[in-house]
Interface confidence: low
C-alpha cells in the first residue's frame, strides 16, 4: 500500500452524561486510515495535569491501513479548558502534523446555515471594479466558529476582523465580508466560505454569474439652446455618452474645432443610471459669434473597449428660417380645482427646430421645473411646433393675472424672442382664441400615430385637427389638448378641449 496520512477525529462524551461532581474526565483522539506506522500523538493540556495512554494500532481489514486512539485523562478545572491533540505522521512528511483543539465534552447544538450573498451583477449585467461577497453563518448554538475564505480551494489572506456576530434568542449569526478585485471575480474562480464549528465543517461556494451581452456605447452632441445663445449670451454644447459599462475603463472626451482654433475648458459629469450603465456628459462653452458664424465643433470619444473612437460634430443648422407663432391659453375652471389652473402655450411653424420656451410672471422668469414642454415635432408643412404647459395657483393670479409665454428662436426679430400674455380670467388672454366654439368631438393623434376619439359628443370628428401631445406629456387634471387646424393658406384657428 502507498503512504497515506491519517484522518484525525476528537473523541468526547456528551456533557449531560458527565456527573457535575466528576473530579477527572477522559477524552480521546482517533487517528485512522494511515500507512505505514507509526503515528506520534501528543497532547497540550494547558495549565492542567493529565495522563495519556496511546492504544496499540489496529489494522483496518479492508484497506490494510492503521488506526490508533490516544486517551487523555485530566483532573481539576477541566470544564473551561480546551485541549489540543497533535498527530504527527513522519512517513507522510517530516513536518506532517494535524492539530485538533476541543473541550472535554460536546453539547447538543444546532449547526449553522452557511450562505454567500454577492453584489456582483448590476442591472446591465456589468461588474463594478470591486465585488463584495457576504458570508452569512446563521442559526447556530452560540459557540466558537472559525471562518475561512477559499479561492479555488486555496486559503485566502483575508482580514476577518470585520466579521460580526449577533445573537437572536438562543441562536447566533455571524457574517464575514470578502472584497474581490474585478479581475479575480471575472477569472471564473470559485470562492468558498468555510465554517468550522464544533469540529464540523460547513461551507457555501459561489462564482460569477453568467455573462451578459455587451451593450453598445452611443454618443450624442447637442447644439446650444437659443436661450443660452441669445439671452444669456453664454452658449454651451454638450457631448453625451450613454450605455457605458462602468467596469470597463475610463471614457475620454476630447473637444476640437474645425477651424483648428483652441477650445475653452470643458466640464465633465458622470452619472450611474438605474440600469447600471454609466452616462458621461462633457459641456463646452462656445463663443456666441463663433457659433453664429458657423464654426463646427467636434467631440471625440475614446474608450479602452471601443474598437475605434466615436466622432460627433455639431454646427449651426443650415436651411430656411421661420419665426415662431406663439398662442397662449388658459383652461376653464375645473370642479374640485378652484385654486389651480393650467395654462398652455402653442408655438408653431418655426424653423429650424432649436427653440427655448420660458414662462414669466410679474416680469420674473419662472423656473424651468415649473413647466413641461414637448420636444419639437414636425408640422405637416416644413416647420416645427411645441406645446408648453404651466400650472398656476390662485395666489399667483390674484397677485397679478398675467402670465407670459416666451419663445426664444434665432429667426424671431428683432431680439430673437416672441411672447404672448395670457390671463386666467376669460377674455384677457393675449393671442388666445377661447371665444371660438370648439368642435363637440375630435379625433386626436400624436405624431403619425392615429388615436381614438377621446371626447364625448355626436358629431363627426373634425377632419384636419390633431393633438399636440399625448397623456404622458400632459399630466394632471384637466387633461388638456390644444388642437390646430392644418388648412393651408388660412390663419390657424385654435381651441382648448378635453380629449
Amino acid at each position: 500500500a502507498s503512504t497515506q496520512s491519517p484522518s484525525v477525529f476528537p473523541l468526547t462524551r456528551c456533557c449531560k452524561n458527565i456527573p457535575s461532581n466528576a473530579t477527572s474526565v477522559t477524552l480521546g483522539c482517533l487517528a485512522t486510515g494511515y500507512f505505514p506506522e507509526p503515528v506520534m500523538v501528543t497532547w497540550d493540556t494547558g495549565s492542567l495535569n493529565g495522563t495519556t495512554m496511546t492504544l496499540p494500532a489496529t489494522t483496518l481489514t479492508l484497506s490494510g491501513h492503521y488506526a490508533t486512539i490516544s486517551l487523555l485523562t485530566v483532573s481539576g478545572a477541566w470544564a473551561k479548558q480546551m485541549f489540543t491533540c497533535r498527530v504527527a505522521h513522519t512517513p507522510s512528511s517530516t513536518d506532517w502534523v494535524d492539530n485538533k483543539t476541543f473541550s472535554v465534552c460536546s453539547r447538543d447544538f444546532t449547526p449553522p446555515t452557511v450562505k454567500i450573498l454577492q453584489s456582483s451583477c448590476d442591472g446591465g449585467g456589468h461588474f463594478p471594479p470591486t465585488i463584495q461577497l457576504l458570508c452569512l453563518v446563521s442559526g447556530y448554538t452560540p459557540g466558537t466558529i472559525n471562518i475561512t475564505w477559499l479561492e479555488d480551494g486555496q486559503v485566502m489572506d483575508v482580514d476577518l476582523s470585520t466579521a460580526s456576530t449577533t445573537q437572536e434568542g438562543e441562536l447566533a449569526s455571524t457574517q464575514s465580508e470578502l472584497t474581490l478585485s474585478q479581475k479575480h471575480w471575472l477569472s471564473d474562480r470559485t470562492y468558498t466560505c468555510q465554517v468550522t464549528y464544533q469540529g464540523h465543517t460547513f461551507e457555501d461556494s459561489t462564482k460569477k454569474c453568467a455573462d451578459s451581452n455587451p451593450r453598445g456605447v452611443s454618443a450624442y452632441l447637442s447644439r446650444p439652446s437659443p436661450f443660452d445663445l441669445f439671452i444669456r449670451k453664454s452658449p454651451t454644447i454638450t457631448c453625451l455618452v450613454v450605455d457605458l459599462a462602468p467596469s470597463k475603463g475610463t471614457v475620454n472626451l476630447t473637444w476640437s474645432r474645425a477651424s483648428g482654433k483652441p477650445v475653452n475648458h470643458s466640464t465633465r459629469k458622470e452619472e450611474k443610471q438605474r440600469n447600471g450603465t454609466l452616462t458621461v456628459t462633457s459641456t463646452l462653452p462656445v463663443g456666441t459669434r463663433d457659433w453664429i458664424e458657423g464654426e463646427t465643433y467636434q467631440c471625440r470619444v475614446t474608450h479602452p473597449h471601443l474598437p475605434r473612437a466615436l466622432m460627433r460634430s455639431t454646427t449651426k443648422t443650415s436651411g430656411p428660417r421661420a419665426a415662431p407663432e406663439v398662442y397662449a391659453f388658459a383652461t376653464p375652471e375645473w370642479p374640485g380645482s378652484r385654486d389651480k389652473r393650467t395654462l398652455a402655450c402653442l408655438i408653431q411653424n418655426f424653423m429650424p427646430e432649436d427653440i427655448s420656451v420660458q414662462w414669466l410672471h410679474n416680469e420674473v422668469q419662472l423656473p424651468d421645473a415649473r413647466h413641461s414642454t414637448t420636444q419639437p415635432r414636425k408640422t405637416k408643412g416644413s416647420g416645427f411646433f411645441v406645446f408648453s404647459r404651466l400650472e398656476v395657483t390662485r395666489a399667483e393670479w390674484e397677485q397679478k393675472d398675467e402670465f407670459i409665454c416666451r419663445a426664444v428662436h434665432e429667426a424671431a426679430s428683432p431680439s430673437q424672442t416672441v411672447q404672448r400674455a395670457v390671463s386666467v380670467n376669460p377674455g384677457l388672454a393675449g393671442g388666445s382664441a377661447q371665444s371660438q366654439r370648439a368642435p363637440d368631438r375630435v379625433l386626436c393623434h400624436s405624431g403619425q400615430q392615429q388615436g381614438l376619439p377621446r371626447a364625448a359628443g355626436g358629431s363627426v370628428p373634425h377632419p384636419r385637427c390633431h393633438c399636440g401631445a399625448g397623456r404622458a406629456d400632459w399630466p394632471g387634471p384637466p387633461e388638456l389638448d390644444v388642437c390646430v387646424e392644418e388648412a393651408e393658406g388660412e390663419a390657424p384657428w385654435t381651441w382648448t378641449g378635453l380629449c
Partner: antibody, heavy 118, light 106 residues
C-alpha cells in the same frame, strides 16, 4: 475631468501617525471606481498601499495591513489615508490615484512629499 | 507578493530610434500588466494596460506585448517628450510595480 489633490503635514515624527487627505473634483467618489493611495520612495520605487471603493469597502497591501486605514467623507468628496507608527522608511511622495476597473491607475494626483524625521 | 523585475535601470537611445523596455514577473500573471511613464516632477501616466491595450489618448508609437511572465513596451520612434522613467505594474494579484527603467538620450 477628474482631478485629485493631496494635502498633508509634510513632516511627521517617528512613531506618530500620518494623516493625508485627497480632495476629488470633477467626479463623485461614490461612483463606480476605486480610490487608491500609492507612494513613491526616494529612488523611485512605487508601492500600492490600498484603496477605498465607491461603496466604501477597503483593501490594503498585506505588508501595511496592521497600520493602515483608508476612509472617506462623501459629503466633501474626500478620502483619507492614516498610517500609524511611522518610521523613516515611510518617507516618500504619496499619491492619491483613481483606478478605473481596479486593474490600472488612470488619474494621479500631483503627489505630496512626506518626511519622517525627529 | 508578485515581483516585477525591470533588469535595465537605464537605457540610452536617440531621437527616432526604436526602443524596447522589458519587464519580468516572478510568476505567471497572464496579460495583467500595465505600463506607465513618469517625467521629472510629474506623476506617473498610464500608457498600456492588459499587456497590449493602448490607453485612450496614448500615441500609437507605444505598443505593449507579452503574456505569462515576460512583457515588453516598445516605442517605435522615440520623441524628445518620451524621455522619462517607465514602470511596469501587475494587476493579477493586488498591485506591484517594477523598479523602473530610465530612458535617456545618448
Amino acid at each position: 475631468d477628474v482631478q485629485l489633490l493631496e494635502s498633508g503635514p509634510g513632516l511627521v515624527k517617528p512613531s506618530q501617525s500620518l494623516s493625508l487627505t485627497c480632495t476629488v473634483t470633477g467626479y463623485s467618489i461614490t461612483s463606480d471606481y476605486a480610490w487608491n493611495w500609492i507612494r513613491q520612495f526616494p529612488g523611485n520605487k512605487l508601492e500600492w498601499m490600498g484603496y477605498i471603493s465607491y461603496s466604501g469597502s477597503t483593501r490594503y497591501n498585506p505588508s501595511l495591513k496592521s497600520r493602515i486605514s483608508i476612509s472617506r467623507d462623501t459629503s466633501k468628496n474626500q478620502f483619507f489615508l492614516q498610517l500609524n507608527s511611522v518610521t523613516s522608511e515611510d518617507t516618500a511622495t504619496y499619491f492619491c490615484v483613481y483606478g478605473s476597473s481596479q486593474r490600472f491607475f488612470d488619474y494621479w494626483g500631483q503627489g505630496t512629499t512626506l518626511t519622517v524625521s525627529s | 507578493d508578485i515581483l516585477m523585475t525591470q533588469s535595465h535601470k537605464f537605457m540610452s537611445t536617440s531621437i527616432g530610434d526604436r526602443v524596447s523596455i522589458t519587464c519580468k514577473a516572478s510568476q505567471d500573471v497572464s496579460i495583467d500588466v500595465a505600463w506607465y511613464h513618469q517625467k521629472p516632477g510629474q506623476s506617473p501616466k498610464l500608457l498600456i494596460y492588459s499587456a497590449s491595450f493602448r490607453y485612450a489618448g496614448v500615441p500609437d508609437r507605444f505598443t505593449g506585448s507579452g503574456s505569462g511572465t515576460d512583457f515588453t513596451l516598445t516605442i517605435s520612434s522615440v520623441q524628445a517628450e518620451d524621455l522619462a522613467v517607465y514602470y511596469c505594474q501587475q494587476h493579477y494579484s493586488l498591485f506591484t510595480f517594477g523598479s523602473g527603467t530610465k530612458l535617456e538620450i545618448k
